[in-house]
Amino acid sequence: APVRSLHCTLRDAQLKSLVMSGPYELKALHLQGQDLEQQVVFSMSFVQGEESNDKIPVALGLKAKNLYLSCVLKDDKPTLQLESVDPKNYPKKKMEKRFVFNKIEINNKLEFESAQFPNWYISTSQAENMPVFLGGTRGGQDITDFTMQFVSS
């Protein structure tokens, strides 16, 4: 059976939107008015992995692009990147672990924990215009809480 996917945008707890700031980079900043159409649209696929009531394994692709968020070690540190894939083979139900995030819902907020690196989360900085990254702390300076907005296909 084909993998189930939905299209959405994400905003962090400060209401910053995510935009493509480079061919393989996302950043977070406040957008308003017509600039809102610049925000990245994700294709969130529901994939194989450990699942519970409040924890759902997903992959986060960029709609209309052969790019997925993935978690890899760089200089011995878990790092978030946009990775190019062969569109003939993706998305798929059994995604490689580096592409998988545990979508955790707490109090109407979402966290995205790396399946490859437990306790590391998709994060944004308090500061404007900074890269989206993989952070190893929750509840600190960096923001790990997001809201999801559905986008019609």
Epitope: V19, S21, G22, E25, L29, D35, E37, Q38, A64, K65
Partner: antibody, heavy 120, light 110 residues
Framework: EVQLVESGGGLVQPGGSLRLSCAVS????????MTWVRQAPGKGLEWIGY???????SYASWAKGRFTISKDSSKNTVYLQINSLRAEDTAVYFC??????????????WGPGTLVTVSS | DIQMTQSPSSVSASVGDRVTIKCQAS??????LAWYQQKPGKRPKLLIY???TLASGVPSRFSGSGSGTDFTLTISSLQPEDFATYYC????????????FGGGTKVEIK
């Protein structure tokens, strides 16, 4: 109102260098990626590359090396540096704003263009 | 390396004619296609984005269709101001690309 104006074109000798500027207003270069496109006399549109909102550049495969795209967000200006100019670089050079609508890159609006003529 | 192939390179037509221009991508680009109109000595103007969405202020006689690799721009009833050159552009990838534009189609008066 969104506006883009290119400048810096003119007559240059083969082997010379040139820096074109694109002054923008009505939007932020921190939000929008920008592109340069050129058009040789009587020919089609040829994409040169992007300067992304984060500051990195992407180039057409043929443009890597001699062409450099940069920006100064504080001056609301994007630049195109061309080195080792050749006769075949003679063209109108356009800058345009890149709108990322559902992740799809669309060029709107465009500047009026600036003509570069390479001749001895 | 995505390549864009436009056809025909030129078309002769009369006012009131229906004109169709095709654009083919060498690989799947979803709905990631835009169309531009350019008149001699002028800057290009966005007509259609995301394959079928009309840009602001563009007359409804222009329409776009297609998805994947094959796309079409249609002018339902050609007007005198529509004689121009039309370009397609893929907006999905900027990596290892020669040109994001098709070669252009010149619409001339018959």
């Amino acid at each position: 109102e969104v506006q883009l104006v290119e400048s810096g074109g003119g007559l240059v000798q083969p082997g010379g260098s040139l820096r074109l500027s694109c002054a923008v207003s009505g939007f932020s270069l921190d939000v929008y990626t920008m592109t340069w496109v050129r058009q040789a006399p009587g020919k089609g549109l040829e994409w040169i590359g992007y300067i992304w909102s984060g500051g990195s550049a992407s180039y057409a495969s043929w443009a890597k090396g001699r062409f450099t795209i940069s920006k100064d967000s504080s001056k609301n200006t994007v630049y195109l540096q061309i080195n080792s100019l050749r006769a075949e670089d003679t063209a109108v050079y356009f800058c345009a704003r890149v709108k990322m609508i559902s992740n799809i890159e669309t060029f709107d609006p465009w500047g009026p263009g600036t003509l570069v003529t390479v001749s001895s | 390396d995505i390549q864009m192939t436009q056809s025909p390179s030129s078309v002769s037509a009369s006012v009131g004619d229906r004109v169709t221009i095709k654009c083919q991508a060498s690989e799947r680009i979803y709905s990631g296609l835009a169309w531009y109109q350019q008149k001699p000595g002028k800057r290009p103007k966005l007509l259609i984005y995301r394959a079928s969405t009309l840009a602001s202020g563009v007359p409804s006689r222009f329409s776009g269709s297609g998805s994947g690799t094959d796309f079409t721009l249609t002018i339902s009833s050609l007007q005198p101001e529509d004689f121009a050159t039309y370009y397609c552009q893929q907006g999905v990838s900027s990596s290892d690309i020669d040109n994001v534009f098709g070669g252009g189609t010149k619409v001339e008066i018959k």
